[in-house]
Interface confidence: medium
């Protein structure tokens, strides 16, 4: 295992690489802050089958991430 | 007020199983990550297995690991340990602790259960 | 693997007295330490966070300070209830969390 640095933040570890598309109900993107110096990429998945931390250095997320700040700004 | 409250403990002969739970109330379990902690009759504390709310990563100390699950079911709000392969030096009282998410985040293990006693004995 | 040491192994006081009780990392932990306190057939109890910041409820008589490798749990004037066990931890490098040995604080 490697080891984590941790601050404040809701997703522990390295997170999954992707989530399929069909399942994901929303996705939150937590920019870095006081309570987590690394961005966070959440998944709500659909059916209410949970939540996911998606790696914010995978491919889907930098996805996620670009759309969202497209809609925002 | 937060409680959690851990069953599923006794005595149980060396290389058998058990399954501890612990029922989780008055905070938002599917956001914080869970552990759980064990202490050794008269000794201190050992971190043993921690599951993040979203109970994908599963992370363990090495003494269990390949022996204890951890898992969680968000929809019941209980966290699980699974035990296989028990052993004598697996006795003692088994903690579920929280480490919250963003909501009451303290930094620590700020909320525990009871704690409930394993025995492998033969 | 993250070891903490704790000393004394066991602090003899009397109520009124201040306690002073150390915590030192194997190697650099930051502001990742937490003390907790335990008494006898209980769970333990959150006492500091983060080297320094109190946990709801644990009164202002405790407090934490240090960073890096060194740490300390101050109780300013102690109270017949402080008298327990008193556990350090670090979540900085993880896994494992680790806890110290501990530190018995009894009566004199």
């Known amino acids: 295992f490697p080891m984590f640095k941790r601050g404040r933040c809701l997703c522990i570890g390295p997170g999954v690489k992707a989530v399929k598309v069909a399942d994901i109900e929303k996705a939150s993107i937590m920019y870095p802050s006081n309570n987590c110096d690394k961005i966070e990429v959440i998944i709500t998945l659909k059916e209410n089958k949970g939540q996911r931390c998606l790696n914010p250095k995978s491919k889907q997320a930098r996805l996620i991430i670009k759309k969202v700040e497209r809609k925002n700004f | 007020q937060v409680q959690l409250v851990e069953s599923g403990g006794g005595v149980v002969q060396p290389g058998r199983s058990l399954r501890l739970s612990c029922a989780a109330s008055g905070f938002t379990f599917s956001n914080s990550a869970m552990h759980w902690v064990r202490q050794a009759p008269g000794k201190g504390l050992e971190w043993v297995a921690l599951i993040p709310f979203d109970g994908y990563n599963k992370y363990y100390a090495d003494s269990v690991k390949g022996r204890f699950t951890i898992s969680r079911d968000n929809s019941k709000n209980t966290l699980y340990l699974q035990m296989n392969s028990l052993r004598a030096e697996d006795t003692a009282v088994y903690y579920c602790?929280?480490?919250?998410?963003?909501?009451?985040?303290?930094?620590?293990?700020?909320?525990w259960g009871q704690g409930i006693l394993v025995t492998v004995s033969s | 693997e993250i070891v903490l040491t704790q000393s004394p192994a066991t602090l003899s006081l009397s109520p009124g007295e201040r306690a002073t009780l150390s915590c030192r990392a194997s190697?650099?932990?930051?502001?990742?330490l937490a003390w907790y306190q335990q008494k006898p057939g209980q769970a333990p109890r959150l006492l500091i966070y983060d080297a320094s910041n109190r946990a709801t409820g644990i009164p202002a008589r405790f407090s934490g300070s240090g960073s890096g490798t060194d740490f300390t749990l101050t109780i300013s004037s102690l109270e017949p209830e402080d008298f327990a066990v008193y556990y350090c931890q670090q979540r900085s490098n993880w896994p494992p969390y680790t806890f110290g040995q501990g530190t018995k604080l009894e009566i004199k």
């Open positions: 190697q650099s932990v930051s502001s990742y």
């Open positions: 602790a929280r480490e919250g998410g963003y909501t009451g985040y303290d930094g620590g293990f700020d909320y």
